[in-house]
């Protein structure tokens, strides 16, 4: 297993609709054809997997149908979007990139993007 540098923004504020996007960029040492991207969430010392996708270079990322993540790739960059976020989902979202094929296998883990989510203010009651 060889190490690889992964860069991502330090801080992002999600939209009022609970959507956060960020770019995960990796320094590919070779010509990988198969790449796996995993998003991990770290909060209160717990690390959980948010979503993962494997893609062939030049193709779209395919997450599971029920995933809260979508993404696109362009060269050594992956643009990740996480939706359905609420204030309780605030935390550090870490991008993990694995170059699966061809060998050698490379692994890179970013420093994480602190995503803040603000629940929208409840609408005032109205009599209609």
């Amino acid at each position: 297993c060889k190490a690889m540098h992964v860069a991502q923004p330090a801080v992002v504020l999600a939209s009022s609709r609970g959507i956060a996007s960020f770019v995960c960029e990796y320094a590919s040492p070779g010509k990988a054809t198969e790449v796996r991207v995993t998003v991990l969430r770290q909060a209160d010392s717990q690390v959980t997997e948010v979503c993962a996708a494997t893609y062939m270079m030049g193709n779209e990322l395919t997450f599971l149908d029920d995933s809260i993540c979508t993404g696109t790739s362009s060269g050594n960059q992956v643009n990740l979007t996480i939706q359905g976020l609420r204030a309780m989902d605030t935390g550090l979202y870490i991008c993990k990139v694995e170059l699966m094929y061809p060998p050698p296998y490379y692994l890179g883990i970013g420093n994480g993007t602190q995503i803040y989510v603000i629940d929208p203010e409840p609408c005032p009651d109205s009599d209609f």
Epitope: P9, V11, L13, A87
Partner: antibody, heavy 116, light 108 residues
Framework: QVQLVQSGAEVKKPGASVKVSCKAS????????ITWVRQAPGQGLEWMGW????????NYAQKLQGRVTMTTDTSTSTAYMELRSLRSDDTAVYYC?????????WGQGTLVTVSS | EIVLTQSPGTLSLSPGERATLSCRAS???????LAWYQQKPGQAPRLLIY???SRATGIPDRFSGSGSGTDFTLTISRLEPEDFAVYYC?????????FGPGTKVDIK
């Protein structure tokens, strides 16, 4: 090295608006947020809100909602804070700081005086 | 919002003494996202501690932070003349970010 340089002191009349700038250098501007904190004479620190330079999304302190607007110009790595309908109790030193997410670098402060 | 309470309001000590400052949160601060800042008259605040216990770049090791959940402490092991200032705690675990009212450390 990381630096945040703010615009100069302002004197405004009640009801007017003020716009303070904060020019960042020494780091990738869009990778962090910019927060604004103010300090009235002899008082503590009051958080006003922040902007994510990555996407322009903002979050304001409830008491200032509707009166404050925070923006960024990523081409010049500059953040702006505009406060409208100024009152005498808005007289304070206004600081910008980098959100990392803790506030690790601060501007030198801008004194805004509201007086008739 | 998370309300932070600092105690004591003023701490009168002599150079060389140990200072212990307390910060209590009204709710648990997630992931120990608590910072301490030092402010001297006429100057901008300066980050001392983040993540409850990590020293910021260039901060001397006489400054240390501890705690988790709702109770946090800043300790200055031996006060130097330049340490007499106001100290603020701040939580950045969830928005709105909030500051404590500050503790003034002055010369006895």
């Amino acid at each position: 090295q990381v630096q945040l340089v703010q615009s100069g002191a302002e004197v405004k009349k009640p009801g007017a608006s003020v716009k303070v700038s904060c020019k960042a250098s020494g780091y990738t501007f869009t990778n962090y947020g910019i927060t604004w904190v103010r300090q009235a004479p002899g008082q503590g620190l009051e958080w006003m809100g922040w902007i994510s330079a990555y996407n322009g999304n903002t979050n304001y302190a409830q008491k200032l909602q509707g009166r404050v607007t925070m923006t960024t110009d990523t081409s010049t790595s500059t953040a702006y804070m505009e406060l409208r309908s100024l009152r005498s109790d808005d007289t304070a030193v206004y600081y910008c700081a980098r959100v990392a997410p803790y506030f690790d670098y601060w501007g030198q402060g801008t004194l805004v005086t509201v007086s008739s | 919002e998370i309300v932070l309470t600092q105690s004591p309001g003023t701490l009168s000590l002599s150079p060389g003494e140990r200072a212990t400052l307390s910060c209590r949160a009204s709710q648990s601060v997630s992931s120990s996202y608590l910072a301490w800042y030092q402010q001297k008259p006429g100057q901008a605040p300066r980050l001392l501690i983040y993540g409850a216990s990590s020293r910021a770049t260039g901060i001397p090791d006489r400054f240390s932070g501890s705690g988790s959940g709702t109770d946090f402490t800043l300790t200055i092991s031996r006060l130097e003349p330049e340490d007499f200032a106001v100290y603020y705690c701040q939580q950045y675990g969830r928005s709105p970010f909030t500051f404590g009212p500050g503790t003034k450390v002055d010369i006895k």
